[in-house]
């Protein structure tokens, strides 16, 4: 009934990041999270199944936000974060027992969300097998306040890459269309 392995791994990832790994001061620095394709990860073609990419990225993302202090800052600001959007590009399969690394990076932020990237890199040849992007929406505070809390001063956000800007535009257009469909244009807003 419960996904016990998920419920064990997530807090373990947070505790490992908080207690055993050094704090990362540079918010935009890439972080690396190791993994290996297990039999339980496979689909019928003996490749890592698509859902596992999101799941592994979940652990890596939580570890990343812990190590750079964002989750701690959110706790102090009595705020929290939810995943508002994600997209994945699969370039090559990961196979049984293949070692890989999830390389996470904070790409930037706007007035409501942080944007993160997770690259699944095969440790056999360094190939980027999958690229995932995430819009991490903040509730109860703003990204600017979180960054200011961490850096002790106001920090201009980095420029978002052009392809990410297109994805943000797509998400906005999608939100508007769904609101129009529901006839809720002025009533509720997506995250």
């Amino acid at each position: 009934l419960l996904d016990v392995w998920y419920l064990v791994r997530l807090p373990c990832a947070v505790l490992r990041a908080r207690l055993l790994q050094p704090r990362v001061r540079d918010l935009l620095a890439e972080q690396r999270f190791p993994g290996r394709v297990l039999p339980s990860d496979l689909d019928l073609l003996l490749h890592m199944n698509n859902a596992r990419y999101l799941r592994e990225a979940d652990f890596a993302r939580v570890a990343h936000l812990t190590r750079c202090g964002v989750l701690g800052a959110l706790r102090q600001l009595r705020a929290h974060t939810v995943l508002a959007a994600s997209c994945a590009r699969h370039r090559r399969s990961l196979r049984l027992l293949e070692p890989f690394e999830v390389r996470t990076r904070l790409l930037g932020w706007d007035d409501r969300a942080f944007y993160l990237e997770a690259r699944f890199v095969s440790l056999r040849d360094g190939f980027v097998c999958a690229l995932l992007r995430f819009r991490q929406h903040l509730l109860g505070t703003s990204p600017e306040r979180v960054v200011q809390h961490l850096c002790q001063r106001r920090v201009e956000p980095p420029e978002l890459p052009a392809d990410l800007q297109h994805w943000i535009s797509y998400n906005e257009a999608s939100s508007q269309l769904l609101r129009m469909e529901s006839g809720l244009s002025d009533v509720t807003k997506d995250q």
Partner: antibody, heavy 120, light 106 residues
Framework: PVQLQESGPGLVKPSETLSLTCTVS????????WSWLRQPPGRGLEWIGY???????NYSPSLKSRVTISVDTSKNQFSLKLNSVTAADTAVYYC??????????????WGQGTMVTVSS | DIQMTQSPSSLSASVGDRVTITCRAS??????LNWYQQKPGKAPKLLIY???SLQSGVPSRFSGSGSETDFTLTISSLQPEDFATYYC????????FGQGTKVEIK
């Protein structure tokens, strides 16, 4: 190898519009940022702005109100228009290719530059 | 705007000298910093990207270091062809250059 070549008038009158074109040869205009920069005589480098092949632009805050950069993918060209010029806009104008890779955004290929003088 | 402050603005050195140029950003820019070399009448040439990575074809006597706000370009043993002006440039948000450091023959 990819090469960039600026073209346009070398003399522009004050209050008029400066127009330059950069032709990209030896490669496609897709998948890069295409930038304009300038360097007044004896001074440092100043970035003007860039365009992505899809049409996304980003301009220097100090020049934003006067600048338009456009791209013509069919001709492998991108262009600069700078309105209401003054003598302070006299400079060598460079076009450059910028890698759009996060953490590696660099001007890796430059044109040889074209001198533009603003004078009546 | 993010301001880039380079120092010194000029320096005199001899062939074989170790030369260090510093660049300071007005706010954190992670490692989004590049170094260029420019000779009179020529377009700038990329030396170092991402604060410390050497561009291919650039001699290994050039090196870069730093992160967040403070960065350094080092030429370990100055060669005759290295007399030029050097610029740092941030690509964190918009693009801004330092005012340049002119390396002259002593």
């Amino acid at each position: 190898p990819v090469q960039l070549q600026e073209s346009g008038p070398g003399l522009v009158k004050p209050s008029e519009t400066l127009s330059l074109t950069c032709t990209v040869s030896g490669g496609s205009i897709d998948s890069y940022y295409w930038s304009w920069l300038r360097q007044p005589p004896g001074r440092g480098l100043e970035w003007i702005g860039y365009i992505f092949y899809s049409g996304i632009t980003n301009y220097s805050p100090s020049l934003k109100s006067r600048v338009t950069i456009s791209v013509d993918t069919s001709k492998n060209q991108f262009s600069l228009k700078l309105n209401s010029v003054t003598a302070a806009d006299t400079a060598v104008y460079y076009c450059a290719r910028e890698l759009p890779v996060i953490g590696r955004r660099t001007f890796d290929i430059w044109g040889q530059g074209t001198m533009v003088t603003v004078s009546s | 705007d993010i301001q880039m402050t380079q120092s010194p603005s000029s320096l005199s050195a001899s062939v074989g000298d170790r030369v260090t140029i510093t660049c300071r950003a007005s706010q954190t820019i992670s490692t989004y910093l590049n170094w260029y070399q420019q000779k009179p009448g020529k377009a700038p040439k990329l030396l170092i990207y991402a604060a410390s990575s050497l561009q291919s074809g650039v001699p290994s006597r050039f090196s870069g270091s730093g992160s967040e706000t403070d960065f350094t370009l080092t030429i370990s043993s100055l060669q005759p062809e290295d007399f030029a002006t050097y610029y740092c440039q941030q690509s964190y948000n918009a693009r801004t250059f330092g005012q340049g450091t002119k390396v002259e023959i002593k």
